[in-house]
């Protein structure tokens, strides 16, 4: 077990803070909830603290919760490939470019680390080149979320990882908006981290609303499990 992994044996409170600017539309989001890495479970509620969110909530899911991939459940035989927990408590910087097909792009930078016993994800997001009447600024996405695989590989030069995946957002007319994600994680501290073999995270997310919440918000339940590395031959013959 890495030293960082010891911090994830129970339920951990999570705080998310985002400041965004998409095509000049500025906004802020606060999120809070908890994670339980034993089950790969995240429960979070997000509030747009500046009024109405200028982009659809589903376009921010990867920035919020795929930001705290330290809550992914890594099976016993894969624990030595869990970069995310090994970087804690000092944490990691997570940078992404997200290309929305035939539309604009988001660039995000986040610091994910423990502050006391709370896991905090502080994010800056800049979005450019979006069409005012497109799927994103035109709010044409359905309020739901598909399952995805998130592919991870070591980046030995930067002592971190590179991650890429393609998100499929459902559009109200029945078509799909693709969002290509290119991600890089580097540790904040200078302690040792686990550099993984290639593998993937399997994610399932459910979006809902709190019927009593008057502010623009999103409630998110997510399960994430690492996969893609088989047991070694010695395991098979036990």
């Amino acid at each position: 077990m890495s030293k960082g992994e010891e911090l994830f044996t129970g339920v951990v409170p999570i705080l998310v803070e985002l400041d965004g600017d998409v095509n000049g539309h500025k906004f802020s989001v606060s999120g809070e909830g908890e994670g339980d890495a034993t089950y790969g479970k995240l429960t979070l509620k997000f509030i747009c603290t500046t009024g109405k969110l200028p982009v659809p909530w589903p376009t921010l899911v990867t920035t919020f919760s795929y930001g705290v991939q330290c809550f992914s459940r890594y099976p016993d035989h894969m624990k030595q490939h869990d970069f995310f927990k090994s970087a804690m408590p000092e944490g990691y910087v997570q940078e992404r470019t997200i290309f929305f097909k035939d539309d604009g792009n988001y660039k995000t930078r986040a610091e994910v680390k423990f502050e006391g016993d709370t896991l905090v994800n502080r994010i800056e997001l800049k979005g450019i080149d979006f069409k005012e009447d497109g799927n994103i600024l035109g709010h044409k996405l359905e309020y739901n979320y598909n399952s995805h695989n998130v592919y991870i590989m070591a980046d030995k030069q930067k002592n971190g990882i590179k991650v890429n995946f393609k998100i499929r957002h459902n559009i109200e007319d029945g078509s799909v908006q693709l969002a290509d994600h290119y991600q890089q994680n580097t540790p904040i501290g200078d302690g040792p981290v686990l550099l993984p073999d290639n593998h993937y995270l399997s994610t399932q997310s459910a979006l809902s609303k709190d019927p009593n919440e008057k502010r623009d918000h999103m409630v998110l339940l997510e399960f994430v499990t690492a996969a893609g590395i088989t047991h070694g031959m010695d395991e098979l013959y036990k």
Epitope: G31, E34, D36, K45, F46, T118
Partner: nanobody
Framework: QVQFVESGGGTVQDGDFLRLSCTAS????????AGWFRQPPGREREFVAA????????LYADSVKGQFTISRDNAKNAMYLQMNRLKPEDTAVYYC????????????????????WGQGTQVTVSS
């Protein structure tokens, strides 16, 4: 803004159990993290237990771990404290408290972090 009414207090014998209830009104309870504090006679108010808005995250004072259980039912706008194997040193006025869930993390034992308080319910444990 949320208001609270505590109930379930009373006088019991050493080793008995009680279940305290805290019922919220005025706002949706699921928008709040919540906790229990107590004030023994002649002493400062002290932290007992806290619970996150989902009910999944809990925190206990060392002195009550394994003895008390905090829970909540958001559908009923209620929070509970199950107190087992009560001892005379558990005698106190018990208060429920809450804090707005976004911007406050539930794992706090500091009374200053909780903005909303009930009037309290007396628990007396006689030997």
């Amino acid at each position: 803004q949320v208001q609270f009414v505590e109930s379930g207090g009373g006088t019991v014998q050493d080793g008995d159990f009680l279940r305290l209830s805290c019922t919220a009104s005025g706002d949706t309870f699921s928008n709040y993290h919540a906790g229990w504090f107590r004030q023994p006679p002649g002493r400062e108010r002290e932290f007992v237990a806290a619970i996150s808005w989902t009910g999944e995250g809990t925190l206990y004072a060392d002195s009550v771990k394994g003895q008390f259980t905090i829970s909540r039912d958001n559908a009923k706008n209620a929070m509970y404290l199950q107190m087992n194997r009560l001892k005379p040193e558990d005698t106190a006025v018990y208060y429920c408290a809450a804090a707005r869930s976004v911007g406050f993390t539930w794992r706090s034992s500091k009374s200053n972090d909780y903005a909303y308080w009930g009037q309290g319910t007396q628990v007396t444990v006689s030997s």
